[in-house]
Interface confidence: medium
């Protein structure tokens, strides 16, 4: 969901109250407060659906809940893409879609979500203890990955308990740096607020004379995110046959969607909202990375600091690939 938060303009303090230093110390807390409030953690959700008609066929759907623009999506199986997983599909908003068997059809559903149909046959059916992972590379958040596993289960539809923190790869120097600054800023803000606790509060009102205040991009967490308190770790457990409605979804919706945990099964907000589809679990892995494309199996040319492109030298193209033009 994309929202915008407006930083309120500050009425200058009365002369003699705190002087120039006072003005700085009053502006800073509000700027930092805005940053702290608007720096929402992005999330990746994963849904795994088993086709009722074809029990060895699965649909994986993934979405990104964040305010950044998505530059690449990688779907892999067997674990996260850089840690033993192998790529099933790579979707680039401009460069096209690449997919590998047994992926049958990968496509964009919205600007921030994708779906992938996976066909299994006999021994290679994806039921065989397979973990599916979706990684979204976005700017400025970096790479976020969530995974859901499909172990064989004799109890279809029952949700697996959240798994203890499996991976959080913190090699995202730039973004972690920003996070560090924000964290420091928030701590400093608390310190300033404590210092100003016993002082008269400054009068805050929108400035009528000054130009519009700077606008900060913000990500407003969905109800589900707030309800789940950002517990990011849950495995998606399905079996090789459709689950029954009552065991799978006390909240309703199609019975074959594996959406866990149930406490997070609210409707998604914004672009990821589909009719009668509960919001899925946070994946069983969440990872943050900097080499946005490197982990997707691309080895792009060096294109300047922090900018990586697919190795197509001819510039941006329309969505093309084996599945046709979007």
């Amino acid at each position: 969901m994309r929202t915008e938060a407006q930083v309120p303009a500050l009425q200058p303090p009365e002369p003699g109250l705190e002087g120039a230093m006072g003005h700085r110390t009053l502006v800073l807390p509000w700027v930092l407060l805005t940053l702290c409030v608007t720096a929402g953690t992005p999330e990746v959700w994963v849904q795994v659906r088993m086709e009722a008609t074809e029990l060895s066929s699965f649909t994986i759907r993934c979405g990104f809940l964040g305010s950044g623009s998505i530059s690449l999506v990688t779907v892999s199986w067997g674990g996260p893409n850089g840690a033993g997983g192998t790529t099933l599909a790579v979707l680039h908003p401009e460069r096209g879609i690449r997919q590998w068997a047994p992926a049958r059809q990968a496509r964009w559903e919205t600007q921030s979500s994708i779906s992938l149909i996976l066909e299994g046959s006999g021994a290679s059916s994806p039921c065989a203890n397979t973990t599916f992972c979706c990684k979204f590379a976005s700017f400025p958040e970096g790479s976020w990955e969530a995974c859901g596993s499909l172990p064989p289960s004799s109890d279809p539809g029952l949700s697996a308990p959240p798994t203890p923190a499996p991976i959080l790869r913190a090699d995202l120097a730039g973004i972690l740096g920003v996070s560090g600054v924000l964290l420091f800023g928030c701590v400093y803000l608390l310190h300033l607020l404590r210092r100003h606790k016993h002082r008269p509060a400054p009068r805050l009102q929108p400035s009528r004379t000054s130009p519009q205040a700077p606008r900060a991009r913000a990500w407003a967490p969905s109800q589900a995110s707030q309800a789940a308190l950002h517990v990011p770790y849950a495995t998606i457990n399905t079996s090789c046959r459709p689950a029954t409605l009552d065991t799978a979804h006390p909240h309703g919706g199609p019975s074959w969607w594996a959406s866990l945990p149930t406490h997070a099964a609210h409707r998604p907000q914004g672009p990821a909202a589909w009719a009668s589809t509960p919001i899925p679990a946070r994946g069983s892995f969440v990872s943050v990375e900097n080499g946005l494309y490197a982990q997707a199996g691309e080895r792009p040319p060096h294109t300047g600091p922090g900018l990586t492109l697919f190795p197509d030298p001819r510039g941006p193209r329309a969505m093309e690939g084996p599945l046709g033009v979007r």
Epitope: T86, T87, A128, E320, G321
Partner: antibody, heavy 120, light 107 residues
Framework: EVQLQQSGPEPVKPGASVKISCKAS????????IHWVRQSHGKSLEWIGY????????GYNQKFKSKATLTVDSSSSTAYMELRSLTSEDSAVYYC?????????????WGQGTSVTVSS | DIQMTQSPASLSASVGETVTITCRAS??????LAWYQQKQGKSPQLLVY???TLAEGVPSRFSGSGSGTQFSLKINSLQPEDFGSYYC?????????FGGGTKLETK
Amino acid sequence: EVQLQQSGPEPVKPGASVKISCKASGYTFTDYNIHWVRQSHGKSLEWIGYIYPYNGGAGYNQKFKSKATLTVDSSSSTAYMELRSLTSEDSAVYYCAREELRRDYGMDYWGQGTSVTVSS
Amino acid sequence: DIQMTQSPASLSASVGETVTITCRASENIYSYLAWYQQKQGKSPQLLVYNAKTLAEGVPSRFSGSGSGTQFSLKINSLQPEDFGSYYCQHHYGTPYTFGGGTKLETK
């Protein structure tokens, strides 16, 4: 040294099945996909499918989906391809080859090939 | 499936000459193309991947170029060991397909 050692030549009768092996050494078996490629006498190469040793997941060329079954035994770093309902059309040299998981390096090492001859 | 069309099917050349083999994809495969060399009775060997990156140990007289649907493999100053068959293969996604091959023979 990376090596893919394939099983020996297989003379088989029409309608029978055959299982050929590809033993990998010199690298971490689960870090690479194993692909299978067919080459009929004097012809080009045809991709049959691949298997991902990490979890045994396989992907097939539709043309070979009912003909070939790919499996792995990670404990012995060996990949297998079973060919069934063989006909004279299936007489060919079958190669295994490895490819880095992210599939952008090409098939960099190949087995020596297994010749399958179907004749009554 | 993506079709790969290679030309010429056969080619005669002498040691020291420069030859070019071309490969055309039936649809855009960006730079996801590999070239292989195969000598009589031997397994194929990777020469080039991602259209222009030389595989490890491949002599610099080999070079790949192209993107989209048109690709070529150029061999400068042919050496005796370069004679054999050459195949292009897309790695844009499965099913992988190979070109029909180019047989490079001595003149």
